[in-house]
């Protein structure tokens, strides 16, 4: 069983491996994993006080 690399992820990392649909690349573990879709809520009606918090669709199980 191999150990994961300990170098910083992100901007300096090589381009992630393409993942199949319904997966995305997780820079933390350097692996394609099941992914849900981020979604932004519908705008509140005019006059609403504060913007609704952003939420997400659950990943497919």
């Amino acid at each position: 069983m191999r150990r994961g690399p300990r170098s910083l992820r992100g901007r300096d990392a090589p381009a992630p491996t393409p993942c199949v649909p319904a997966e995305c690349f997780d820079l933390l573990v350097r692996h394609c994993v099941a992914c849900g879709l981020l979604r932004t809520p519908r705008p509140k009606p005019a006059g609403a006080s504060s913007p609704a918090p952003r939420t997400a669709l659950q990943p497919q199980e």
């Epitope: 191999r2 995305c24 997780d26 692996h31 994993v33 099941a34 879709l37």
Partner: antibody, heavy 125, light 107 residues
């Protein structure tokens, strides 16, 4: 329903070994990464190790490297933490957790969404 | 390793108060920060991920903001069930690291 159940904790003498199990249901562990996080009595959370069960890739906190081994059996949908050469400072509640991901520009926007109930490991003579 | 420093370490507040907890990363972690709530004897519960996204089922009085090195968790109107300890965590790079926690107590 997603559920994680840890077992295997207990009292062990310094230098001894324990094997913790994390049985998952409601999802397939090979689709996610599984993490162990511990919490010493009265202290904060400390990440211990992670595994991507689909390929067995792992990583460890420096404090446990060379002593602990994380593994997974995808046929049993279960992750494990083998703990050897235990020390008093390893005394803690050990949690397993699933890391969930949502698609974003940088790949995964993720966090640990489901946690087990925890299992207490006490290292004492 | 990236250090996550939370402040304050504890605070006293009343029901209905607006509460703000901050977390500072020792280096840029983009928006790869989550917030958790933990009550005594229980496992942590996810509140916020990717700095500002509310996790499913979490009340909308919780919100998160920030990017880079400075992050904030806000409870807009504290409820009795919100008295707990809150942790930030970065997952920009391994090892993922937690803040030391902020205990929210009843005034």
């Amino acid at each position: 329903e997603v559920q994680l159940v840890e077992s295997g904790g207990g009292l062990v003498q310094p230098g001894g070994s324990l094997r913790l199990s994390c049985a998952a249901s409601g999802f397939t562990i090979s689709s996610n990464s599984i993490h162990w996080v511990r919490q010493a009595p009265g202290k904060g959370l400390e990440w211990v190790a992670w595994i991507t069960p689909s390929d067995g890739n792992t990583d460890y906190a420096d404090s446990v490297k060379g002593r602990f081994t994380i593994s997974a059996d995808t046929s049993k949908n279960t992750a494990y933490l083998q703990m050897n050469s235990l020390r008093a400072e390893d005394t803690a509640v050990y949690y397993c957790a699933r890391r969930v991901c949502y698609s974003s520009v940088r790949g995964c926007a993720g966090a640990m969404d489901y946690w087990g109930q925890g299992t207490l490991v006490t290292v004492s003579s | 390793d990236i250090q996550m420093t939370q402040s304050p370490s504890s605070l006293s507040a009343s029901v209905g108060d607006r509460v703000t907890i901050t977390c500072r990363a020792s280096q840029d972690v983009s928006t790869a920060v989550a917030w958790y709530q933990q009550k005594p004897g229980k496992a942590p519960k996810l509140l916020i991920y990717s700095a500002s996204f509310l996790y499913s089922g979490v009340p909308s009085r919780f919100s998160g903001s920030g990017s880079g090195t400075d992050f904030t968790l806000t409870i807009s109107s504290l409820q009795p069930e919100d008295f707990a300890t809150y942790y930030c965590q970065q997952s920009y790079t391994t090892p993922p690291t937690f803040g030391q926690g902020t205990k929210v107590e009843i005034k």
